[in-house]
Interface confidence: low
């Protein structure tokens, strides 16, 4: 037989108030060991007159057939208690002398043997006739996982001999499995909740539970699925799930009802240039939904208010857009608007941004080239050209003159300032084709360069030049 | 009921630029945000690109040197464009309602050979 | 570069319970990935399951359900059929771009 218990504490050998299976002498006391998997027997007491370990008359395959079955003694079959209590059970058998070859009892779970810090112990009873083999396992504070099938194998004549299973079932409080998700929903629209509790025990309700009072006025099985008809404010929703055990609460989730985004906020100018600025925000609170883009909005500060608002749109990541196209030295108002699928958020407040100035947009006009031979120098004159308020200041001019001869190349450029409209430049190779161009500059770069002009400096005196191909309208003059 | 047909030829040839169309029925561009995807034969499903309500857009990363997608409100259509066309990009291209993958249209298969 | 995994297959018994995931390389799914579930048979165009985690689109029955498990995105066909038998593919929404799922092929036994 066997026997399984909840203890508090006791000691392994007065674990068994009734008598031992098998045939155990009143003065007898057993020899222990602790389990390992494959335990050997204890050595023989004296006045044996066949220990069990010991060798003994040959035996015939015919004659092996005939030695009496040997098996595991009937022990309980079904073990339930709760969470957290300590069990014992165990397994015998009883040896006869006949059986030469023995091997020590393992324990199994669910068909994997249970190897290293399981708590087990076996115990050794011999008498004259053979040994009695008990195999104690304990489990302290059982767990769910401790849940399932336990039994006990050992070899006997290289037979292998299995116990009958020992289940042991853990009951304990409602386990959950699936609880019921955060969502976001939109407004007065259905949408679904699940939850799953588990035992044992069996069967496991569940009460739904919005902003803290219950949703159904019966249980329902679990698993269980609410169907909420929609929300226009926001709620919390949990389940209990109860079982014979008592009561477990799943966590509160919040289910969130989906608006417009909030504006976005702290609007900056991250770089001005001419005709572009770079703009960034923080986008609002989402509204519980993802923002999907985002509407740049841009009006002429300067203009009366009927000004017209340029709109730029933009994926919703990452927070900055470059407005491009703007007219250079100008003040413009920028504000920025979010979406998501519920619709646009306001404008953030309007901030101020100002375009720098621009380079010059024409070429300086009426260029002339004039070689003079006395001083070896090309004499070059222009007309400033028209510059306008939002191409900057004019702060001077480029020239570039390159020379060209058979075999020769040379590129240079000068800059001059702003006072006057000619300059002067040394005569860098004779016999060789000079072509001069102009650019004016401002603070806000180089503008375009002047038609080229082109002048042939002779070996000797004698001189040709192309006049500007840029005279202002009604100018002819020649040199 | 909201449907989707997708339009654009069933041959190109490397290096071309595919064009491809989806119109919309029974419901507003202005209100509904179009995604394109892709499915090569025996493969898995491949976003390309989104158009949203307002007129913006979002690409795949890998892709979006070769994409282009927009929109005609007042024609209900959705256009995709890609260029530099490549026998990999063989595959059956569909569009579908944006946020809820659940209206599909039929795809139409490209093949792209010489 | 984002990758979603699916279960590359699953089998189910007729009027069984199948549960396919959806994990994203990322980290955990959240309600902000809009998962969305898309059943394909062969040669037909894909068909809307869920979005938005745990909507269900028109006319979908609902054996049909979607949630986040754990980490994951999951969707649960109960009572399965014969003609469940399809490839379903998921999609995770990051920001601003879909990336789907290389999909699950689910076969249907007997």
């Known amino acids: 037989g066997g026997t399984a218990e909840k203890w508090e504490e006791t000691e392994l050998d007065q674990l068994f108030s009734g008598p031992l299976p098998g045939r155990l002498p009143v003065n007898h006391r057993p020899f222990s060991a602790p389990h390992s998997s494959r335990d050997q027997l204890p050595p023989p007491q004296t006045g044996r007159s066949h220990p069990a370990h010991t060798a003994a008359p040959q035996v015939t395959s015919t004659a092996s057939k005939l030695l009496p079955p040997v098996a595991f003694n009937h022990t309980i079959g079904h073990i339930v208690l709760s969470e957290h209590k300590n069990v014992k059970f165990n397994c015998s058998i009883n040896i006869p002398n006949t059986y030469q070859e023995t091997a020590g009892i393992s324990w199994w779970k669910d068909g994997k043997e249970l190897l290293g810090a399981h708590h087990s112990i076996t115990q050794f009873y011999p008498d004259e006739e053979g040994v009695s083999i008990i195999a104690l396992f304990s489990i302290a504070s059982v767990q769910r996982s401790d849940n399932g099938s336990y039994f006990c194998k050992m070899k006997v004549n290289n037979r292998e001999i299995v116990s009958d299973p020992i289940y042991v079932e853990v009951q304990g409080l409602p386990y959950f499995i699936k609880q019921p998700e955060s969502v976001n929903v939109t407004r007065n629209t259905a949408f679904n909740l699940t939850c799953q509790a588990v035992g044992p025990p069996e069967p496991v309700n569940i009460f739904w539970v919005q902003n803290s009072s219950r949703v159904n006025e019966k249980p329902e099985r679990s698993p269980s699925v609410l169907t909420v008809p929609g929300l226009t404010e926001t709620a919390v929703f949990s389940c209990e799930a109860h079982n014979d055990k008592g009561l477990t609460v799943s966590k509160g989730v919040h289910i969130n009802i989906k608006v417009i985004p909030s504006p976005p906020t702290e609007v900056h100018i991250l770089n001005s240039t001419a005709h572009s600025i770079l703009v960034s925000w923080v986008p609002g609170f989402d509204g519980y939904s993802p923002l999907q883009n985002c509407s740049i909005q841009v009006k002429e500060a300067d203009r009366l208010s009927n000004g017209s608002v340029m709109v730029f749109n933009t994926s919703a990541s990452p927070h900055l857009y470059e407005i491009q196209q703007l007219q250079a030295l100008a003040n413009y108002s920028i504000a920025v608007s979010c979406r998501n699928e519920i619709g646009w958020s306001a404008v953030s407040p309007w901030i101020l941004a100002s375009t720098t100035e621009g380079a010059p947009s024409v070429a300086p006009l009426n260029i002339t080239v004039f070689l003079n031979e006395s001083n070896n120098i090309l004499d070059i004159r222009w007309t400033k050209p028209p510059i306008k308020r939002q191409d900057g200041e004019l702060v001077g001019y480029r020239i570039s003159h390159v020379w060209e001869s058979a075999g020769t190349y040379k590129e240079l450029s000068e800059e001059v300032s702003q006072n006057g409209s000619w300059a002067q430049i040394p005569v860098q190779i004779h016999n060789a084709t000079c072509t001069v161009r102009i650019a004016a500059i401002t603070k806000g770069g180089i503008g375009p360069f002047s038609e080229p002009v082109n002048i042939i400096i002779p070996e000797h005196s004698k001189v040709d030049y192309a006049p500007s191909s840029t005279p202002a309208p009604g100018n002819t003059d020649s040199m | 009921q909201v449907t989707l047909k997708e339009s654009g030829p069933v041959l190109v040839k490397p290096t071309e630029t595919l064009t491809l169309t989806c119109t919309v029925s029974?419901?507003?561009?202005?209100?509904?945000?179009i995604s394109w995807i892709r499915q090569p034969p025996g493969k898995a499903l491949e976003w390309l690109a989104v158009?949203?309500?307002?007129?913006?857009?979002d690409y795949n990363s890998a892709l979006k040197s070769r994409l282009t997608i927009s929109k005609d409100t007042s024609k209900s259509q959705v256009v995709l464009t890609m260029t530099n066309m490549d026998p990999v990009d063989t595959a059956t291209y569909y569009c579908a309602s944006h946020w809820y993958l659940d209206v599909w249209g039929q795809g139409t298969t490209v093949t792209v050979s010489s | 570069q984002t990758v979603v995994t699916q279960e590359p297959s699953f089998s189910v018994s007729p009027g069984g319970t199948v549960t396919l995931t959806c994990r994203s390389s990322?980290?955990?799914?959240?309600?902000?990935?809009?998962a969305n579930w898309v059943q394909q048979t062969p040669g037909q165009a894909p068909r809307g399951l869920i979005g938005g985690a745990n909507s269900r689109a028109p006319g979908i029955p609902d054996r049909f359900s979607g949630s986040i498990l754990g980490n994951k995105a999951a969707l649960t066909i109960t009572g399965a059929q014969a003609d469940d038998e399809s490839d379903y593919y998921c999609a995770l929404w990051f920001s601003n771009h879909w990336v789907f799922g290389g999909g699950t092929k689910l076969t249907v036994l007997g």
């Open positions: 990322t980290g955990a799914v959240s309600t902000s990935n809009y």
């Open positions: 158009i949203w309500t307002g007129g913006g857009t």
């Open positions: 029974g419901i507003s561009l202005s209100s509904f945000a």
